[in-house]
Amino acid sequence: SETTTGTSSNSSQSTSNSGLAPNPTNATTKAAG
């Protein structure tokens, strides 16, 4: 899939995680079909 500028994180959220996509893992591989 393609995203133009991605999903922006909300600075008012309590989480301190970056809103960028995390490192890829094989668990994120798309299902076939």
């Epitope: 500028t5 301190s16 960028l20 094989n26």
Partner: antibody
Framework: QVQLVQSGAEVKKPGASVKVSCKAS????????MNWVRQAPGQGLEWMGE????????YFNQKFKSRVTMTRDTSISTAYMELSRLRSDDTAVYYC???????????WGQGTTVTVSS | DIQLTQSPSFLSASVGDRVTITCRAS??????LAWYQQKPGKAPKLLIY???TLHSGIPSRFRGSGSGTEFTLTISSLQPEDFATYYC?????????FGQGTKLEIK
């Protein structure tokens, strides 16, 4: 050690396309997003987009969305960036860079100079 | 999109000086700011990420601080190899954005 080796310099005519390659070694190619950043002569750094090497999911800078194609070949640990409908202001050094989630753009290729001239 | 404003754009200093470069974000980016050094004809090199964490192999004279919208890069005692252009970059959200750069020149 981590290395990103890019293809050589290109000279293109306006309206043409260019495809730059970036071969990774020294780490698991599928474990990190590959980003593309360009730098026009004497100017700053401009992010173009990134690709997930497993799923091929992509995030783009809106500015390049209609002209850039990012692909990858996991069998040879190589990422590609193709820019179409070239204009003179696309003359720049194009870099690939590995993005680590916590660390950001931690390793960069040596850069590929693309010159667009009639 | 977030905007990053670096100041100053140009900085003249001498070997041994302490220098500070500032990067301001147009909205909060938490701690997610990185700093890069670039020398002419070379690729940028990561110095600091997440505001204050030194990348592996980077000398301890480089120090990053700040969070939210205001960040600083301090070089405690300039060495001859430190004269270069420095860029900040936010890694909090898409699109990834760089500051316009600060060129550090020998006085």
């Amino acid at each position: 050690q981590v290395q990103l080796v890019q293809s050589g310099a290109e000279v293109k005519k306006p309206g043409a396309s260019v495809k730059v390659s970036c071969k990774a070694s020294g780490y698991d190619f599928t474990g990190y997003h590959m980003n593309w950043v360009r730098q026009a002569p004497g100017q700053g750094l401009e992010w173009m987009g990134e690709i997930n090497p497993i799923t091929s999911d992509k995030y783009f800078n809106q500015k390049f969305k209609s002209r850039v194609t990012m692909t990858r070949d996991t069998s040879i640990s190589t990422a590609y960036m193709e820019l179409s409908r070239l204009r003179s202001d696309d003359t720049a050094v194009y870099y690939c860079a590995r993005r680590d989630y916590g660390t950001s753009l931690d390793y960069w290729g040596q850069g590929t100079t693309v010159t667009v001239s009639s | 999109d977030i905007q990053l404003t670096q100041s100053p754009s140009f900085l003249s200093a001498s070997v041994g000086d302490r220098v500070t470069i500032t990067c301001r974000a147009s909205k909060s980016i938490s701690k997610y700011l990185a700093w890069y050094q670039q020398k002419p004809g070379k690729a940028p090199k990561l110095l600091i990420y997440a505001g204050s964490t030194l990348h592996s192999g980077i000398p301890s004279r480089f120090r990053g601080s700040g969070s939210g919208t205001e960040f600083t890069l301090t070089i405690s005692s300039l060495q001859p190899e430190d004269f270069a252009t420095y860029y900040c970059q936010q890694h909090n959200e898409y699109p990834i954005i760089f500051g316009q750069g600060t060129k550090l020149e020998i006085k």
